[in-house]
């Protein structure tokens, strides 16, 4: 595998990769010389973060957000070398890519899930949402897939919109010239588009993890 | 302890509308997806309708389709259920449930009921 | 839709007996959506099993569940006099269906 950029800014860090980062370095001042097991490191630290509270995590989200506004300041002005066809710049302005309807149903589910077992990792909480949906009839799955259908409808429609109104210079710097077929060009959005929505679930993850304490 | 109370039941004529109200406490309500379930006289069971969580996705049976409009307010801890043209048919006990999973859906508390007679 | 039909519509038993009370379902049915529910007179239904075989939470251990094929059974080991109700099964694999309920009176 070839280095990637080295001009290419660097990604944005999560709330949870600051306070990581933190506890880090608080255990190389505290151990030195000391060897760290990653997989025991990772779950104190996990296990650490879940029993914070929205205070104590408000000073690793004030950092990502700043980080976050540092990365799309960067990505504005980054020009990617020639041939990297891979992460084109992303407008913000370009139509956000609708949810389907899994989505729409994790969503609705995800906040009782996390109340409940506080304790579950992520992957752990998507589990559980994949088997709700798998179990969930088809008739109840029906109107999320009536919502993701018309959210689908109308994002092609905005999507279309956008293409005709040309996308701006920032975004056109950022795009490789070679023509492409309207096919290939198609798939490649629809691949990113699927990274977002990964991305999305993600800080959907990150920001609700503060608000499980209703009860 | 899990509370569901029904409310708003009564005599109404044919034809006319009704709108049953179901308090839930003891629990946190916006978590759940909620259900109403009747009961006519002296019979079975029959599932009427389904809300999901924040109230964004619902369905009915059949049967009461584009009459009945089930809604809920999470910050009352509130469901609702508003009958309209009502037939003779409708007449049940009306439950409202709370709709849970642990490896399978089921309801898992019901209200006591409230009863609804639709006759002239 | 998914008929369920229970069999018998009622069951005399005595306290201290065994009672068995089947449900069938009219097609396939994911065994983890099936529920079995207790009813008395002027009551609401109450949960005891769900995904076919889970004792609901304080529901004692005479109460248990099974499944072959299409057909979901509750059995009761020995029946408690407080016992005596309608029992109705239901399932969530298209739209919520119950059985029509089998009636468990004293012999």
């Known amino acids: 595998m070839g280095k990637g950029d080295p001009k290419k800014p660097r990604g944005k860090m999560s709330s949870y990769a600051f306070f990581v980062q933190t506890c880090r370095e608080e255990h190389k001042k505290k151990h030195p010389d000391a060897s760290v097991n990653f997989s025991e490191f990772s779950k104190k630290c996990s296990e650490r973060w879940k029993t914070m509270s929205a205070k104590e995590k408000g000073k690793f989200e004030d950092m990502a957000k700043a980080d976050k506004a540092r990365y799309e300041r960067e990505m504005k002005t980054y020009i990617p070398p020639k041939g990297e066809t891979k992460k084109k710049f992303k407008d913000p302005n370009a139509p956000k890519r609708p949810p389907s309807a899994f989505f729409l149903f994790c969503s609705e589910y995800r906040p009782k899930i996390k109340g409940e077992h506080p304790g579950l990792s992520i992957g752990d909480v998507a589990k559980k949402l994949g088997e709700m949906w798998n179990n969930t009839a088809a008739d109840d799955k029906q109107p999320y897939e009536k919502k993701a259908a018309k959210l689908k409808e109308k994002y092609e429609k905005d999507i279309a919109a956008y293409r005709a109104k040309g996308k701006p210079d920032a975004a056109k710097k950022g795009v490789v010239k070679a023509e492409k077929s309207k096919k290939k060009k198609e798939e490649e959005e629809d691949e990113e588009d699927e990274e977002d929505e990964e991305e999305e679930e993600d800080e959907e993850d990150e920001d609700e993890e503060e608000d499980d304490d209703d009860e | 302890e899990v509370q569901l109370l029904e409310s708003g039941g009564g005599l109404v004529q044919p034809g006319g509308s009704l709108r049953l109200s179901c308090a839930a406490s003891?629990?946190?309500?916006?978590?759940?997806?909620m259900l109403w379930v009747r009961q006519a006289p002296g019979k079975g069971l029959e599932w009427v309708s389904y809300?999901?969580?924040?109230?964004?996705?619902?369905n009915y049976a059949d049967s009461v389709k584009g009459r009945f409009t089930i809604s809920r307010d999470n910050s009352k801890n509130t469901l609702y259920l508003q009958m309209n043209s009502l037939r003779a048919e409708d007449t049940a006990v009306y439950y409202c449930?709370?709709?849970?999973?642990?490896?399978?859906?089921?309801?898992?508390?019901w209200g006591q009921g409230t009863l609804v007679t639709v006759s002239s | 839709d998914i008929q369920m039909t229970q069999s018998p519509d009622t069951l005399s038993l005595s306290p201290g007996e065994r009672a068995t009370l089947s449900c069938r379902a009219s097609?396939?049915?994911?065994?983890?959506?099936l529920a079995w529910y207790q009813q008395k007179p002027g009551q609401a239904p109450r949960l005891l099993i769900y995904?076919?075989?889970t004792r609901a939470t304080g529901i004692p251990d005479r109460f248990s569940g099974s499944v072959s094929g299409t057909e979901f059974t509750l059995t009761i080991s020995s029946l408690q006099p407080d016992d005596f109700a309608t029992y109705y099964c239901?399932?969530?694999?298209?739209?919520?269906?119950f059985g029509q309920g089998t009636k468990l009176e004293i012999k």
């Open positions: 449930a709370r709709w849970d999973y642990n490896s399978g859906w089921y309801y898992d508390h």
């Open positions: 003891g629990f946190t309500f916006s978590w759940y997806s």
């Open positions: 809300i999901s969580p924040s109230g964004g996705f619902t």
């Open positions: 097609q396939s049915v994911n065994s983890r959506n």
């Open positions: 995904g076919a075989s």
């Open positions: 239901q399932q969530y694999n298209s739209y919520f269906t």
